[in-house]
């Protein structure tokens, strides 16, 4: 069971300084920006991240978003990334969801997060290269010091 | 509690192959992998590479990619590491070892090297 | 790829004394490392994990701190089944890499 608490407007980071943004395909890619461009390209760079109470604390659950014309939330069905056009729901009677991750950071580094599934153990967001791209990806992982499954995360509040 | 039982010693000679087996017992949760270790009599233990059952998908150390095979049979529950051209530098134990996630008390995950297989004695020799 | 220097190499101490087993990487690898104990014709054995968390069933007289580049193991009252070797691993990134190894023997 997940419970939704507060949400924050974030800007999400690669470990490359590179920025989140959600393209006009609705596709989230990383892109070399400087604070101007981020603000410009608002609000496909800022994130609405929820946070949610989990009855099996696991770290802390929270569901990725943005509103554009419409509010989009990151999905990771059938462990494929994509965002889906609905809010970020209240209550999730569920152990496990497509939309939850588990917002950690990672040990030693309280600025460096990593984004684990709820509904595959093992697999983090990450942001890998495809072609000229650098795409926002669901990853297995077992390298938990690979900085593709790191990211920064700055309050945009 | 899982056991992992790998196959028995073996005595070969330069050049030939030896493939090691690693037969899982006991419950074990999904999302683990096996990985390989060896270790040269009176030596360290030296990391070989891992085999993940779920997409058969490997990594292996440099010093062995050209010369080790990892595999596994999900309907046995059993993995096996082959390494050819061998040569007297490769007498050592060999150990299969499963790799799965542990976690702390704020669910932040660790991968850990939690049972051993009792090792294999490969003793190449002409 | 990432080096362990595992130090000493080796430690000769008597039962109820306080030994301590460092190991250092050659970069970053966060709190991703483990100790292992050996003992003769056997297999390795967690102790630690996650650089400070005790494995269950571990005595608690084991414990490891350390974050980023810097470990340390310490037994704090050797008892007689402590003599055995020691390794330390990151697993911070592939080729996973060991120390080198500390025996200890008693005095």
């Known amino acids: 069971y997940f419970g939704k608490l507060e949400s924050k407007l974030s800007v999400i980071r690669n470990l490359n300084d590179q920025v989140l943004f959600i393209d006009q395909g609705n596709r989230p890619l990383f892109e070399d920006m400087t604070d101007s461009d981020c603000r410009d390209n608002a609000p496909r760079t800022i994130f609405i991240i929820s946070m949610y109470k989990d009855s099996q604390p696991r770290g802390m659950a929270v569901t990725i978003s943005v509103k554009c014309e419409k509010i989009s939330t990151l999905s990771c069905e059938n462990k494929i990334i994509s965002f889906k056009e609905m809010n970020p729901p209240d209550n999730i009677k569920d152990t496990k969801s497509d939309i939850i991750f588990f917002q950690r950071s990672v040990p030693g580094h309280d600025n460096k997060m990593q984004f684990e599934s709820s509904s595959y153990e093992g697999y983090f967001l990450a942001c890998e290269k495809e072609r000229d791209l650098f795409k926002l990806i669901l990853k297995k992982e077992d390298e938990l010091g690979d900085r593709s499954i790191m990211f920064t995360v700055q309050n945009e509040d | 509690q899982v056991q992992l039982v790998q196959s028995g010693a073996e005595v070969k000679k330069p050049g030939a192959s030896v493939k090691v087996s690693c037969k899982v017992s006991?419950?074990?949760?999904?999302?683990?992998?096996f990985h390989w270790v060896r270790q040269a009599p009176g030596k360290g233990l030296e990391w070989m590479g891992r085999?993940?059952?779920?997409?058969?998908?490997?990594k292996y150390a440099e010093r062995f990619k050209d010369r080790v095979t990892m595999t596994e049979d999900t309907s046995t529950d059993t993995a096996y590491m082959e390494l050819s051209s061998l040569r007297s530098e490769d007498t050592a134990v060999y150990y299969c070892?499963?790799?799965?996630?542990?976690?702390?008390?704020?669910?932040?995950?660790?991968?850990?090297?939690?049972?051993w297989g009792q090792g294999t004695l490969v003793t190449v020799s002409s | 790829d990432i080096q362990m220097t595992q130090s000493p190499s080796s430690v000769s101490a008597s039962v109820g004394d306080r030994v301590t087993i460092t190991c250092l990487a050659s970069?970053?690898?966060?709190?991703?490392l483990t100790w292992y104990q050996q003992k003769p014709g056997k297999a390795p054995k967690l102790l630690i994990y996650?650089?400070?968390k005790l494995q269950d069933g571990v005595p608690s007289r084991f414990s490891g701190s350390g974050s980023g580049t810097d470990f340390t193991l310490t037994i704090s009252s050797l008892q007689p089944e402590d003599f055995a070797t020691y390794y330390c691993?990151?697993?911070?990134?592939?080729?996973?890499?060991f120390g080198q190894g500390t025996k200890l023997e008693i005095k």
């Open positions: 996650g650089a400070n």
């Open positions: 070892t499963t790799w799965r996630i542990y976690r702390d008390s704020s669910g932040r995950p660790f991968y850990v090297m939690d049972a």
């Open positions: 006991g419950e074990i949760s999904t999302g683990y992998y």
């Open positions: 691993l990151q697993g911070s990134k592939f080729p996973l890499t």
């Open positions: 085999i993940d059952p779920e997409d058969d998908s490997t």
């Open positions: 970069e970053d690898i966060y709190t991703y």
